[in-house]
Every structure is written in C-alpha cells, then in structure tokens.
Interface confidence: low
C-alpha cells in the first residue's frame, strides 16, 4: 500500500506516535517520505547483506527475521514480512522500540540528512487529524 | 498449503527468448522472496537470483545478469523469469523455489531445450 | 563467492548401514547451511535447515551437525528411500551457493 502523507499522518497518530519519545507527528511522516517514499512494501538490500523492510525501512540485522540475514538479532521480536503489510501496527509498535534504544530517530538515516531541524511540521499542515 | 505451479516444458531456438512461470498458493505471495535456481546434468544447482514480488525488488547471480529478469505480477500470485539470447548453455531444468534463506517449497521444475 | 565442497562425490551403502556426508565450505559461514535430498526427475526436499534443524515431516534418522566451514549429514540406518542424491547451500552470503552433490546409491 502506498499512503497518502495525510492518511499515514493518521494512521501514525492513531497508533500513538505523536510526540512519541518526545518526536513530534512531523518527524515519524518525514521518515516514512524519504525512508519509503510511504510505500509499505518497500525493501532495500543493505552491503551488510541485511534488508530494510516496509514504510519505515526497519533493518533485518537488528529487529526482525527474515531467515536470510546472518546473526539477525530480530530484537522487534517479528518476521520481517509483518513489516510489509498494509496495515502499519507492526511498523509502528518495532519503530517505537527502535527509538527508545537509546539513539532516538536518528537510527533512521533519511530522518537524519533529510529531516532532522527542518520545518517537519510542513508534513503534517493540512491534515485533518 | 503452500504450492508453487511451474509452466511446462519448452522447446526453443537459439538465440531466442522464453519466458517460465510460477503460481504461488497457499500463502501472503507479495511477503516471501522468490528464488531461482538452475539445474544441469553435471553442474548441481546455480542460484540465478531472487524477486520480492510486493516492491518488485530484484537480486541477480553476477553470472546470470542479462541473461534472466525477473518479475511479478501480485493480481494474479505469479513470478515470472524471463531468459534471453538463448544457447544450448542454457537447456536446464528451472526451479522456483521460496525464499527464507533456506528453500522450504519448490516448484515441480520447467525443462528448457535449446536446440 | 563462497564454494561448497562435498564428499565423497558417490557413496555406496546398504540398508540399515549408517552414513555420514560432508559439506566444506571455503570461508567460516556459521550455521547457515542447509541440507537438501533430491530424488530423479523431483524436486529438491529440504530435510535440514541451519546446520541442525530438522525440518516437519521429515525422519528422525537424519541429523545435521557442524560451524564455521565444515557441515555433516548423518543418516542413522539408511533405508531405501533414502537414496539419491544431496546438496549443501549456504544463506550466509550472496550469491547463494550448493555444493555438487553426493550421491547415495546402493550397493
């Protein structure tokens, strides 16, 4: 499923991110743009041999198992195919464990060169929420 | 259960193109990888390259790159792999198989003739 | 890439022997190796995944064992419907890679 920036704007504060870990709704659809271009199916290969996988590009070494990454540590405790679902509650619920481990959104490299102390609420304007 | 549907047979001319395909049932299609492998007599089993049917992404055997593409087409749960420029190096049989690293379920096979 | 070697090429046993083949692999691949029975004109069947896994369905009397480079495949009193032929692959890297095979005949 590809989401619109305002239908994922909604999904995400349903799903309780606004101002998750003290990261404003902005942030979480700024990721999702330049991380997926919010597209839930999105995979990428990694050089490590890993994959990002789903709207958030959550990362097979770390959080999930996709039964090909070795050493896969799948800290989300998830397949990663639940990450590539239309329905976003497992991106969701892995990404905010993500950003409590310590490093907050900057795990996400796209938050962090294209996100990271510009206006994000610009991503949220015009949204009914 | 899960099952994978290989077309049949093919008979073709060198130098030409054939396309094989591959019906997944049985489980979420766009989710798992599929893999493909090709199996001659006297070269054991080559890993050609896998797809992630629900983005499209595509992962190619350095060997097999311009000779197979892959895609997929999620309306209908079918893979599809595409080899070009057909020689004889290429009469094999060819296996879908699905991904997790290891290959649980494989398809039944597709003999391909280049002759 | 990662080559995976197999021996011995053709194995020779009877009914009831036990046999153990072997899968070298030429660089430390951990524990992702996988092993497969293919009977002629059949598809491959996963029997064993991650170096000792055994897959549903399959008999107790196959066993896998192994890290780093050097992988076996026990069977424990083979019975004749186990012959054919075997394949290693590994998923540590890509390309995914099989070794040639040993083939497991009666004598």
């Known amino acids: 499923k590809v989401f619109g920036r305002c239908e994922l704007a909604a999904a995400m504060k349903r799903h309780g991110l606004d101002n998750y870990r003290g990261y404003s709704l902005g942030n979480w659809v700024c990721a999702a743009k330049f991380e997926s271009n919010f597209n839930t199916q999105a995979t990428n290969r990694n050089t490590d041999g890993s994959t990002d996988y789903g709207i958030l590009q959550i990362n097979s070494r770390w959080w999930c198992n996709d039964g090909r990454t070795p050493g896969s540590r799948n800290l989300c405790n998830i397949p990663c195919s639940a990450l590539l679902s239309s329905d976003i509650t497992a991106s969701v619920n892995c990404a905010k464990k993500i950003v409590s481990d310590g490093n907050g959104m900057n795990a996400w490299v796209a938050w962090r060169n294209r996100c990271k102390g510009t206006d994000v609420q610009a991503w949220i304007r015009g949204c009914r929420l | 259960q899960v099952q994978l549907q290989e077309s049949g047979a093919e008979v073709m001319k060198p130098g030409a193109s054939v396309k094989i395909s591959c019906k997944a049932t049985g489980y979420t299609f766009t989710t798992y990888w599929i893999e493909w492998v090709k199996q001659r007599p006297g070269h054991g089993l080559e890993w050609i390259g896998e797809?992630?049917?629900?983005?499209?992404?595509?992962y190619y055997n350095e060997k097999f790159k311009g000779k197979a593409t892959f895609t997929a087409d999620t309306s209908s749960n079918t893979a599809y792999m595409q080899l070009s420029s057909l020689t004889s190096e290429d009469s094999a049989v060819y296996y879908c198989?699905?991904?997790?690293?290891?290959?649980?379920?494989w398809g039944q096979g597709t003999t391909l003739t280049v002759s | 890439d990662i080559e995976l070697t197999q021996s011995p090429a053709t194995l020779s046993v009877t009914p009831g022997d036990s046999v153990s083949l072997s899968c070298r692999a030429s660089?430390?691949?951990?524990?992702?190796l996988h092993w497969y029975q293919q009977k002629p004109h059949e598809s491959p069947r996963l029997l064993i995944k991650y170096t000792s896994q055994s897959m549903s369905g399959i008999p107790s009397r196959f066993s896998g064992s192994g890290s780093g480079t050097d992988f076996t495949l026990s069977i424990n009193s083979v019975e004749t419907e186990d012959f054919g032929m075997y394949f290693c692959?590994?998923?540590?890297?890509?390309?995914?890679?099989f070794g040639g095979g040993t083939k497991l005949e009666i004598k």
């Open positions: 692959q590994q998923s540590n890297s890509w390309p995914r890679t």
């Open positions: 660089q430390s691949i951990s524990n992702n």
């Open positions: 198989a699905r991904g997790d690293g290891h290959y649980g379920y």
């Open positions: 797809i992630l049917p629900g983005s499209g992404s595509t």
